[in-house]
Interface confidence: low
Amino acid sequence: LRLLDHRALVCSQPGLNCTVKNSTCLDDSWIHPRNLTPSSPKDLQIQLHFAHTQQGDLFPVAHIEWTLQTDASILYLEGAELSVLQLNTNERLCVRFEFLSKLRHHHRRWRFTFSHFVVDPDQEYEVTVHHLPKPIPDGDPNHQSKNFLVPDCEHARMKVTTPCMSSGSLWDPNITVETLEAHQLRVSFTLWNESTHYQILLTSFPHMENHSCFEHMHHIPAPRPEEFHQRSNVTLTLRNLKGCCRHQVQIQPFFSSCLNDCLRHSATVSCPEMPDTPEPIPDYMPLW
């Protein structure tokens, strides 16, 4: 979790002088409770937005938006603490809106936004907005939380972000797998425009079962520049196991930007259709 870099963080708006500060996620009002505290945020909305850094990189960001309730408690509102919790790691990042002037009611409902929390593909977050000062220990809560899931790199808008492109999201290998005679598979895929090696991982399964009956790994050396975007054809020999007929082919690239952690692509070959007439049951059990 981090903030979008090199960006002037602004929270001022007409009628309000405001500054954005880093926060330890432990506001002073927890330690020194106040008697009068504001009510909670209203209509908290979290959306997936995309923002460029000054270097031109594109990142997914959490766009946080909320409004104030139209009650007298805004007279005691001194700011807000925005917290983003990454659920699988429990990592938390906070910022604080510090109001440098008193809020007054005006003809429109007060609305606040913040779009500088950088989020990761395929991660889940809990976003909380706390109005400050926080309530006394037994006081009514004055925060709102919402859960937010960032889609993975297969999502069209995500695909072109820097973190997704770094993991090879733009590479479409267009894998084809063909069953040949003599227990062989021909795997064909499109190479990317980088001189890096690939690995083909073959896993075979019995019909309708999920435990593998054959596994094989095939290394493909780095292509030369003239081979970029060309098709690579590989013939894999299968073990002659009766019923070991469903094959999953996975291609793992080793691009320089993601090394061992690049997006993998896969294709599956189903078992051939069973004949309508049942095969005679052998009078012995094959040992495999």
Partner: antibody, heavy 125, light 107 residues
């Protein structure tokens, strides 16, 4: 092994409010989303809405004006109230565990994998 | 809302038959689809999630396939305990919606 158990009145009068509670045992309510689904006799299934541990809710637009959900993590329970009931609300009501999240109108979730056995609710005077 | 259209609405089959149930979405839903089995008086039970992934403990004769708008649940060899109603559920868009169900009856 997570188990869900619905409880509530079997009979409710028209225009009254239906309260239902689902108790989660064998696991923590803090780890998933929790939903309600209903099924009128001989008919299909309708998703009512879901609640998360933080109290965030999403309701089916067709029922939104009448539905309220709440959660009590200390009791490992979540609840449904359906107001202004009519005979059309007569159904078996199920609670279920659901694992999903939202993002900018894109909803990524993985369906309901654990269900309660259901409780029959009849709306009649 | 996304409409899920299941076909057929009912079918009669014999033990040992291969049964195929289809579900069509009114718009693309990637592979965000599950298949559920419901017996009279019981809660639905999930068989397949993510269009083709097996729910643990479900017999391997059940399989799912499809992506986008067309999906299929196949029972390779119908067993006596498989006579039930089957529903598809899309969980790609809010709100989640079920198909109207396919009742599998004994011929």
């Amino acid at each position: 092994q997570v188990q869900l158990q619905e409880s509530g009145p079997g009979l409710v009068k028209p225009s009254e409010t239906l309260p239902l509670t689902c108790t989660v045992s064998g696991g923590s309510i803090r780890s998933y989303y929790w939903s309600w689904i209903r099924q009128p006799a001989g008919k299909g299934l309708e998703w009512i809405g879901r609640i998360y541990r933080s109290g965030n809710t999403i309701y089916n637009p067709s029922l939104k004006s009448r539905v309220t959900m709440s959660i009590d993590t200390s009791k490992n329970q979540f609840s449904l109230t359906l107001s202004s009931v009519t005979a059309a609300d007569t159904a078996v009501y199920y609670c279920a565990r659901e694992n999903y999240s939202e993002s900018s109108g894109l909803y990524y979730y993985y369906g309901m994998d654990v269900w309660g056995q259901g409780t029959t609710v009849t709306v009649s005077s | 809302d996304i409409q899920m259209t299941q076909s057929p609405s009912s079918l009669s089959a014999s033990v040992g038959d291969r049964v195929t149930i289809t579900c069509r979405a009114s718009q693309g839903i990637r592979n965000d689809l599950g298949w559920y089995q419901q017996k009279p008086g019981k809660a639905p039970k999930r068989l397949i999630y993510a269009a083709s992934s097996f729910q643990s403990g479900v017999p391997s004769r059940f399989s799912g396939s499809g992506s986008g708008t067309g999906f299929t649940l196949t029972i390779s060899s119908l067993q006596p305990e498989d006579f039930a109603t089957y529903y598809c559920l899309q969980h790609n868009s809010y709100p989640p919606t079920f198909g109207q169900g396919t009742k599998v009856e004994i011929k």
